[in-house]
């Protein structure tokens, strides 16, 4: 089932998706699409990278991270209720039935009229368990900045445990990195 992320109308939404290139600059094509991942590629493509660069994009959709290091997380600018739905991140790893696909559900909430609350959760509460996702190779433990150690395997949308965009933004801003062996 899809991992769920939340954002408010007028905010930027953040949908995490990561991989680590086998070698620096040796990029894997990635596509983002609106709608569940189909058999191949992405339907309703909103952004695409190739082995070198972003080669297709549409307005309001961009990669805020360093995609050359495998951070292909999608930022959707100034979201509206119409942006709600499932998004597909597909990492097009070469090989036979080898590509990785992730369906992420974006839920847009109406804008709050009350002042935005301060951070209510720390990262320890946000990660009560180890994060693990399926992969093809051995697991690798990675320390995320000054956060608690989190075990990850191979390829990850990072946040099988994350549930909202604000928290995901906090994580991104902390300089977290994920490596894939």
């Amino acid at each position: 089932s899809e991992v769920e992320y939340r954002a408010e109308v007028g905010q930027n939404a953040y949908l995490p998706c990561f991989y680590t290139p086998a070698a620096p600059g040796n990029l894997v094509p990635v596509c983002w699409g609106k709608g569940a991942c189909p058999v191949f590629e992405c339907g309703n493509v909103v952004l695409r990278t190739d082995e070198r660069d972003v080669n297709y994009w549409t307005s309001r959709y961009w990669l805020n991270g360093d995609f050359r290091k495998g951070d292909v997380s999608l930022t959707i600018e100034n979201v509206t209720l119409a942006d709600s739905g499932i998004y597909c991140c597909r990492i097009q790893i070469p090989g036979i039935m080898n590509d990785e696909k992730f369906n992420l559900k974006l839920v847009i909430k109406p804008a709050k009229v009350t002042p935005a609350p301060t951070r209510q959760r720390d990262f320890t509460a946000a990660f009560p368990r180890m994060l693990t996702t399926r992969g093809h190779g051995p697991a690798e433990t990675q320390t995320l900045g000054s956060l608690p150690d989190i075990n990850l395997t191979q390829i990850s949308t990072l946040a099988n445990e994350l549930r909202d965009s604000r928290l995901a933004n906090d994580l991104r801003d902390s300089g977290a990195t994920i490596r894939i062996g």
């Epitope: 699409g33 709608g35 189909p38 058999v39 191949f40 080669n55 070469p94 039935m97």
Partner: antibody
Framework: QVQLVESGGGLVKPGGSLRLSCAAS????????MSWIRQAPGKGLEWVSF????????YYADSVKGRFTISRDNAKNSLYLQMNSLRAEDTAVYYC????????????????WGQGTTVTVSS | EIVLTQSPGTLSLSPGERATLSCRAS???????LAWYQQKPGQAPRLLIY???SRATGIPDRFSGSGSGTDFTLTISRLEPEDFAVYYC?????????FGQGTRLEIK
């Protein structure tokens, strides 16, 4: 005009091999995923395999996995299907088809088909 | 594997009548990834509808597609003699790509 032409079919004994070819013309071949689909006599359509435009991403139906190999030569605008360890149940007309999904567009459907080539597996 | 079940197996109608063909999926398919094809004897299939409801290039407007989730429909509003053929639905939503078993539309 946009065209796909298959060749290489024929009669082969069980356990034998055959290589099908599909020559494409009239479009930028490397932009498109391509598929092989087969149709047994009097039966419906069965998807066999697809390959991405660059040739890097490949999928197979379970029924042919490990026996069939799809490949392409973009310089020659050609698609291939190497069929090994053939069985009687592989007897069919084999079609190559262009998958309509092209970079940056949102279109799923096999919009161009060849005329088909017949493969008969019989002793 | 998503199984597509088409009904009826055979539909007998006269030219000028309306034809309604059904395709039911064993699990939900995004409408973006559902296509319909027409096949005449001795010929390759021809794409009619993609994305459940979009007509392919050159397809007459008497052909229309609809539906979502698990239930999809191909409608031919007024049958022409050349429309009598076998019709297949197909899904691209998950691997493997699958086709329905076909509906044969024959002249009554």
């Amino acid at each position: 005009q946009v065209q796909l032409v298959e060749s290489g079919g024929g009669l082969v004994k069980p356990g034998g091999s055959l290589r099908l070819s599909c020559a494409a013309s009239g479009f930028t071949f490397s932009d498109y995923y391509m598929s092989w689909i087969r149709q047994a006599p009097g039966k419906g359509l069965e998807w066999v395999s697809f390959i991405s435009g660059s040739g890097s991403i490949i999928y197979y139906a379970d029924s042919v996995k490990g026996r069939f190999t799809i490949s392409r030569d973009n310089a020659k605008n050609s698609l291939y299907l190497q069929m090994n360890s053939l069985r009687a149940e592989d007897t069919a007309v084999y079609y190559c088809a262009r998958d309509g999904m092209v970079r940056g567009m949102n279109f799923y459907g096999m919009d161009v088909w060849g005329q088909g080539t017949t493969v008969t597996v019989s002793s | 594997e998503i199984v597509l079940t088409q009904s009826p197996g055979t539909l007998s109608l006269s030219p000028g009548e309306r034809a309604t063909l059904s395709c039911r999926a064993s699990q939900s398919v995004s409408s973006s990834y559902l296509a319909w094809y027409q096949q005449k004897p001795g010929q390759a299939p021809r794409l009619l509808i993609y994305g459940a409801s979009s007509r392919a290039t050159g397809i007459p407007d008497r052909f229309s597609g609809s539906g979502s989730g698990t239930d999809f429909t191909l409608t031919i509003s007024r049958l022409e003699p050349e429309d009598f053929a076998v019709y297949y639905c197909q899904q691209y939503g998950s691997s493997p790509i699958t086709f329905g078993q076909g509906t044969r539309l024959e002249i009554k």
